[in-house]
């Protein structure tokens, strides 16, 4: 399930000077470099989590500059220009703004943490080159985290870090079709730590999802649900404090 390819490889098709995988050119922006907060809209929505917002302000130690995490985020509707100077995105693959579905307070209200479980709508489905970014902090004594890319009642991609499965830490990936779970794919590399901030990035590729955590490539998961346009929601749950969830096209 893991591989040695990176986002850079995926986009350029060439060798990658950063063997760790997902390059720092877009990964670890300095806080002063600017960023792309997702657009937001005010008001609470029936059936959605209570007021929260993203782009949220990144918690201490998180990854400023990643999509959706913008230290000192401006009021909703205020949109800074593209980053420049150190950490700016390369022009060849500059990410766009992040798609956003917060339920914020009044205009200008400070962003707060998102309520978990949280649903990020993907109303147009997913498409190759879509990058989904989740920022948060693992709770102390955490047991599990789960990302569920949902297609109606099915789960196209279930990403499930387990902190204590028979005294082992393991990441389980699977697909649920017609209420039946398929064959599990297990990954023993486990980059999450209780009490620590994290950044999960999921890049949609034509035939697989590619997952990086804290800017290091972790795994890929071949598409079992082929109709990507029907994957209409990302459910985020588990023992985390969630700061932001957003997407961008790269």
């Amino acid at each position: 399930m893991a591989d040695n390819f990176s986002l850079h490889d995926a986009l350029s098709g060439s060798g990658n000077p950063n063997p760790q995988g997902w390059p720092g050119a877009w990964g670890n922006q300095p806080a002063g470099a600017g960023g792309y907060p997702g657009a937001s809209y005010p008001g609470a929505y029936p059936g959605q989590a209570p007021p929260g917002a993203y782009p949220g302000q990144a918690p201490p130690g998180a990854y400023p500059g990643a999509p959706g995490a913008y230290p000192g985020a401006p009021a909703p509707g205020v949109y800074p220009g593209p980053p420049s100077g150190p950490g700016a995105y390369p022009s060849s693959g500059q990410p766009s703004a992040t798609g956003a579905y917060p339920a914020t307070g009044p205009y200008g209200a400070p962003a707060g943490p998102l309520i978990v479980p949280y649903n990020l709508p993907l109303p147009g489905g997913v498409v190759p080159r879509m990058l989904i970014t989740i920022l948060g902090t693992v709770k102390p004594n955490a047991n599990r985290i789960a990302l569920d890319f949902q297609r109606g009642n099915d789960v196209a991609f279930h990403f499930n870090p387990r902190f204590n499965e028979n005294n082992r830490r393991v990441i389980v990936c699977n697909t649920k079709l017609d209420n039946n779970w398929g064959r599990e794919e297990r990954q023993s590399v486990f980059p999450f730590e209780s009490g620590k901030p994290f950044k999960i990035q999921v890049l949609v590729e034509p035939d697989h999802f590619k997952v990086a955590v804290n800017d290091a490539h972790l795994l890929q998961y071949n598409h079992r649900v082929k109709k990507l346009n029907e994957i209409s929601k990302l459910g985020i749950s588990g023992d985390i404090d969630l700061t932001s969830a957003s997407y961008t096209m790269i």
Partner: antibody, heavy 115, light 107 residues
Framework: QVQLQQSGAELVRPGASVNLSCKAS????????MNWVKQRPGQGLEWVGM????????HYNQMFKDKATLTIDKSSSIAYMQLSSLTSEDSAVYYC????????WGQGTSVTVSS | DIVMTQSHKIMSTSVGDRVSITCKAS??????VAWFQQKPGQSPKLLLY???TRHTGVPDRFTGSGSGTDYTLTISSVQAEDLALYYC?????????FGSGTKLEIK
């Protein structure tokens, strides 16, 4: 083939409510968000809101949050939009449309508010 | 809210001409742009989505391009049946918004 069949035209009194329906066929109803769009005579298109038929999660345009209520009946693959406290400003054609990019549209339901 | 601006309300053209209709978003909408055609008394019809992907059954004379805030619908050789209203739309961030429309008419 994908079809969205909307209910017939409505003539209603000011202050009343109306319930519009959109019956989906030709695809898996729960796999796509359903949008509702308003178009006043001679005017452009306004997004009212959307609902996920798999779990009834809704998102509304703030302009319509006290006007429209979106619901679904999963068993019959029907999406509904209730419009309340109607005024002449609500006279319009209302469309249902599937998916974020709205790839298939209903034929529209004309709502006329008149005393 | 994201504002989608179609600066040309009316565009005059002739059959066989190439015409480009533009749409500018008030912020980056990351190619989540669709284009619709609407004729009088009819529902809108999707032409293109993800800025450049042609919807099923749409003739290949319709093409789309753009990224960031600027998007274009091009009809390579206008046919009589293309005379209609054209709307752009973003489904990037709610409320989803439409441009005000561009009417394509014969000179």
């Amino acid at each position: 083939q994908v079809q969205l069949q909307q209910s017939g035209a409505e003539l209603v009194r000011p202050g009343a409510s109306v319930n519009l329906s959109c019956k989906a066929s030709g695809y898996t109803f729960t796999n796509y968000w359903m949008n509702w769009v308003k178009q006043r005579p001679g005017q452009g298109l306004e997004w009212v809101g959307m609902i996920d038929p798999s779990d009834s999660e809704t998102h509304y345009n703030q302009m319509f949050k006290d006007k429209a209520t979106l619901t679904i009946d999963k068993s019959s693959s029907i999406a509904y939009m209730q419009l309340s406290s109607l005024t002449s400003e609500d006279s319009a054609v209302y469309y249902c449309a599937r998916w974020g990019a709205m790839d298939y549209w209903g034929q529209g339901t004309s709502v006329t508010v008149s005393s | 809210d994201i504002v989608m601006t179609q600066s040309h309300k009316i565009m005059s053209t002739s059959v066989g001409d190439r015409v480009s209709i533009t749409c500018k978003a008030s912020q980056d909408v990351s190619t989540t742009v669709a284009w619709f055609q609407q004729k009088p008394g009819q529902s809108p019809k999707l032409l293109l989505y993800w800025a450049s992907t042609r919807h099923t059954g749409v003739p290949d004379r319709f093409t789309g391009s753009g990224s960031g805030t600027d998007y274009t619908l091009t009809i390579s050789s206008v046919q009589a049946e293309d005379l209609a209203l054209y709307y752009c739309q973003q489904h990037y961030s709610p409320p989803f918004t439409f441009g005000s429309g561009t009417k394509l008419e014969i000179k």
